[in-house]
Structure formats: structure tokens, C-alpha cells
């Protein structure tokens, strides 16, 4: 059965997936797809990495962590109800039938109605992702996400809040992790 994760409409969703590279920089291809993991690949692929880089992605999907260290957790920007469903993270370990696959269920809840807008506390939205594609991805450099009006003090505050809340550790603890090598 799938592990369940939740987000509200308009927020960024986070789907954790990790592996431990056998050696620094010794990366393994990874794909993310919408739909449960099939026997090969990732259903409808939304993002993928190769041994060096993110080489394909679609709008609103990115890797916010350090994928070169095995953090291949998926961020989905500005989710809608249509983003609900099962997602597949597949660690494509070379060899005979070595793939590791994880099904993660994303549940999107309607946004809470609040009298006044609250400050965006999602640290993942604070920085755009600048990626130049390789291989099969779009040819041009894309900026995924938007850069909010934010100053260095706010960035520092957000970083401290993230560290203090131990959110990163909590998310890592709840995610799928495998060790390679």
C-alpha cells in the first residue's frame, strides 16, 4: 500500500524519496511519474535524472533537494485538486532486476479559507530552480517556480525556521530511503 502525503490547494507538495549513492557523484538514474510504478519506468514521466543531471522535467515539478547526494524528493509547485493521486519514484539501479520503486499517494485538500493572507512559509518556494537540460529535455534553460519578493533577512529567517522546526529531518525520516553499494 502507498504511503500517504497531504498538501493544500495552492501550496507546494513534497514527496520524499532518497537513496545513498555508492560513492560521491556516483549517481543512479531516477524517474518520477504520475501513476503507480509499473514494471519498468515511471508511468507518465514528469521528471527524470541520469548519472549526472536532471535531464527531463515538466512544468511545476522539480527536485528541491541535493539530488547529487541522493535526495530525489519531488516538489510539485502550486498544487490543484487534479494533482491528487499516486506518484512513482523509481531508483533505476543498474543490473539484473535491481530497480527500487516506491508508490506515494498525494492527497490534496481544499485550501483553508482564512480572513487574511498568511505569509508563505514554504521554504521550497523561496528559490527558483535553474536547470539546463541534457539529453531528452527541453533545449532551453528554464526557471521553475517564481521568485517571491523576499529579502536576505527573510531568507535567513526562513532558513532558521526550517532548521528549528526540524522539518527536513522529519521529512527525511518519513520518506523512502535505500542504500546503494
Amino acid at each position: 500500500s502507498e504511503v500517504e502525503y497531504r498538501a493544500e490547494v495552492g501550496q507546494n507538495a513534497y514527496l520524499p524519496c532518497f537513496y545513498t549513492p555508492a560513492a560521491p557523484g556516483n549517481l543512479v538514474p531516477v524517474c518520477w511519474g504520475k501513476g503507480a510504478c509499473p514494471v519498468f519506468e515511471c508511468g507518465n514521466v514528469v521528471l527524470r535524472t541520469d548519472e549526472r543531471d536532471v535531464n527531463y522535467w515538466t512544468s511545476r515539478y522539480w527536485l528541491n533537494g541535493d539530488f547529487r547526494k541522493g535526495d530525489v524528493s519531488l516538489t510539485i509547485e502550486n498544487v490543484t485538486l487534479a494533482d491528487s493521486g499516486i506518484y512513482c519514484c523509481r531508483i533505476q539501479i543498474p543490473g539484473i532486476m535491481n530497480d527500487e520503486k516506491f508508490n506515494l499517494k498525494l492527497v490534496i485538500k481544499p485550501a483553508k479559507v482564512t480572513p487574511a493572507p498568511t505569509r508563505q512559509r514554504d521554504f521550497t518556494a523561496a528559490f527558483p530552480r535553474m536547470l539546463t537540460t541534457r539529453g531528452h529535455g527541453p533545449a532551453e534553460t528554464q526557471t521553475l517556480g517564481s521568485l517571491p519578493d523576499i529579502n536576505l533577512t527573510q531568507i535567513s529567517t526562513l532558513a532558521n525556521e526550517l532548521r528549528d522546526s526540524r522539518l527536513a529531518n522529519d521529512l527525511r525520516d518519513s520518506g523512502a530511503t535505500i542504500r546503494i553499494g
Epitope: C31, G33, G35, A36, P38, V39, F40, E41, C42, G43, N44, V45, Y56, Q92, I93, P94, G95, I96, M97, N98, D99, H136
Partner: antibody, heavy 122, light 107 residues
Framework: EVKLVESGGGLVQPGGSLRLSCAAS????????MAWVRQAPGKGLEWVAN????????YYLDSLKSRFTISRDNAKNSLYLQMNSLKAEDTAVYYC???????????????WGQGTLVTVSS | DIQMTQSPSSLSASVGDRVTITCRAS??????LAWYQQKPGKAPKLLIY???TLAEGVPSRFSGSGSGTDFTLTISSLQPEDFATYYC?????????FGQGTKLEIK
């Protein structure tokens, strides 16, 4: 036009070896997983093996993985099946088939070769 | 292994008939199901993939439905060229497995 052409079949004695080849054309070979599927005379279809885009990952029917090896040469647009220690029950038509592509989505063997007959008999 | 069970094993029908073939998976395969048509001495031909998507060049009288464990292939109005053997196949679990086939014969 997508074309898959198998070769290398024939009559072989039990315990012998054969290497099947599949020449692909009409599509970007390195963008697709490829497969071998076999069909014994008068029987149904049985999956044999799959290989990913660059050959780094392979997948087999458990009962065959110690004797069969799937491989590919993207520079030659070719798929191979090395079959060792052949048994009478390996007698079948062997088909090469194109499987899922780089972006996923289409899960089915969209194109098949005409097949090559392997007969294992003394 | 995921077992695929087709029914019926054989079926007699006439040109113009509506025909339904079912396929049941022993485990949830979501929508990772394909249907093939095979004529004697020929390679199989993909009809439907992802349970309900018509493959390129396949006439619209063919349709697929279902998800999870129960799937159906329907031919809305049989044509003479449709008499053949039909197979379902799952792409969810390893090993990939096929149904045993349904032979569609002329009544």
C-alpha cells in the same frame, strides 16, 4: 515505418547455444525499452526478457535468467538474445518487440518482428 | 507472479455481433493492461494499451475498459478480419504475464 527483423533461429541440439538478433529501424532505437517474447507451437505468449535504453538494466523471466542474456547495441540499432544450455521446452517462435519509451505512458508492446523459430531437438 | 485469466477461452460469433472478452488479474495492476490480436502464423498486434487507449491504426470498433483487476475488450460490430486469437497482458509486475488467449471463431 517501424521495422523489427529477427534472425538467428534454427535447429539446435539440447544443451546447445544460439544467439538471436533483432535489427530495428524507423525509430530512435535508444529511446525505447526492448523485449523478447516467445510462443511455443500451438501455445500462448510468454515474456522472456526486457532491457532498458542503454543496456544497463535487464529483466528476465526467473526460470530463464541463468541461461538467457539480453543485450543491445544502440550504435547498430540491434537487440540480442544469447541462449545457452537450450532445452526442448525452449522450442518456440521468438519475437522481438518494442516496449515503453523514454517518457513512459504507453505500456504495451507496440511493434513486433515477424519472429524467428528456434527448435531444440536431438 | 500476477496471473492473468481470460474468459471465455473460445467464442463463436457472427459478423456484426457485439463481442466482449474479459481478463482478470490476480492482483491490482491499476491500468497497466494491453490487449493484442494474433492471427495464425503472424506476430501479435497491439490493440489497446493502458487498459483503454486505442493503439495507432486500430479501428474504433475496438474498445477497452476496466482498472485494478477486471478488464474488458469489446468489439462493437465484428468484421470478417476480426476472427483471431486475443491476448491480454499486464505491465505492472515482474514477470510480465499474458492471459491464455481467447480464440474468436466464426459461428
Amino acid at each position: 515505418e517501424v521495422k523489427l527483423v529477427e534472425s538467428g533461429g534454427g535447429l539446435v541440439q539440447p544443451g546447445g547455444s544460439l544467439r538471436l538478433s533483432c535489427a530495428a529501424s524507423g525509430f530512435t532505437f535508444s529511446d525505447y525499452y526492448m523485449a523478447w517474447v516467445r510462443q511455443a507451437p500451438g501455445k500462448g505468449l510468454e515474456w522472456v526478457a526486457n532491457i532498458n535504453y542503454d543496456g544497463s538494466s535487464t529483466y528476465y523471466l526467473d526460470s530463464l535468467k541463468s541461461r538467457f542474456t539480453i543485450s543491445r547495441d544502440n550504435a547498430k540499432n540491434s537487440l540480442y538474445l544469447q541462449m545457452n544450455s537450450l532445452k526442448a521446452e525452449d522450442t518456440a517462435v521468438y519475437y522481438c518487440a518494442r516496449d515503453v519509451g523514454y517518457y513512459g505512458g504507453n505500456y504495451g508492446f507496440a511493434y513486433w518482428g515477424q519472429g524467428t523459430l528456434v527448435t531444440v531437438s536431438s | 507472479d500476477i496471473q492473468m485469466t481470460q474468459s471465455p477461452s473460445s467464442l463463436s460469433a457472427s459478423v456484426g455481433d457485439r463481442v466482449t472478452i474479459t481478463c482478470r488479474a490476480s492482483d491490482n495492476i491499476y491500468s497497466y493492461l494491453a490487449w493484442y490480436q494474433q492471427k495464425p502464423g503472424k506476430a501479435p498486434k497491439l490493440l489497446i494499451y493502458n487498459a483503454k487507449t486505442l493503439a495507432e491504426g486500430v479501428p474504433s470498433r475496438f474498445s477497452g475498459s476496466g482498472s485494478g483487476t477486471d478488464f474488458t475488450l469489446t468489439i462493437s460490430s465484428l468484421q470478417p478480419e476480426d476472427f483471431a486469437t486475443y491476448y491480454c497482458q499486464q505491465h505492472y509486475g515482474s514477470p510480465l504475464t499474458f492471459g491464455q488467449g481467447t480464440k474468436l471463431e466464426i459461428k
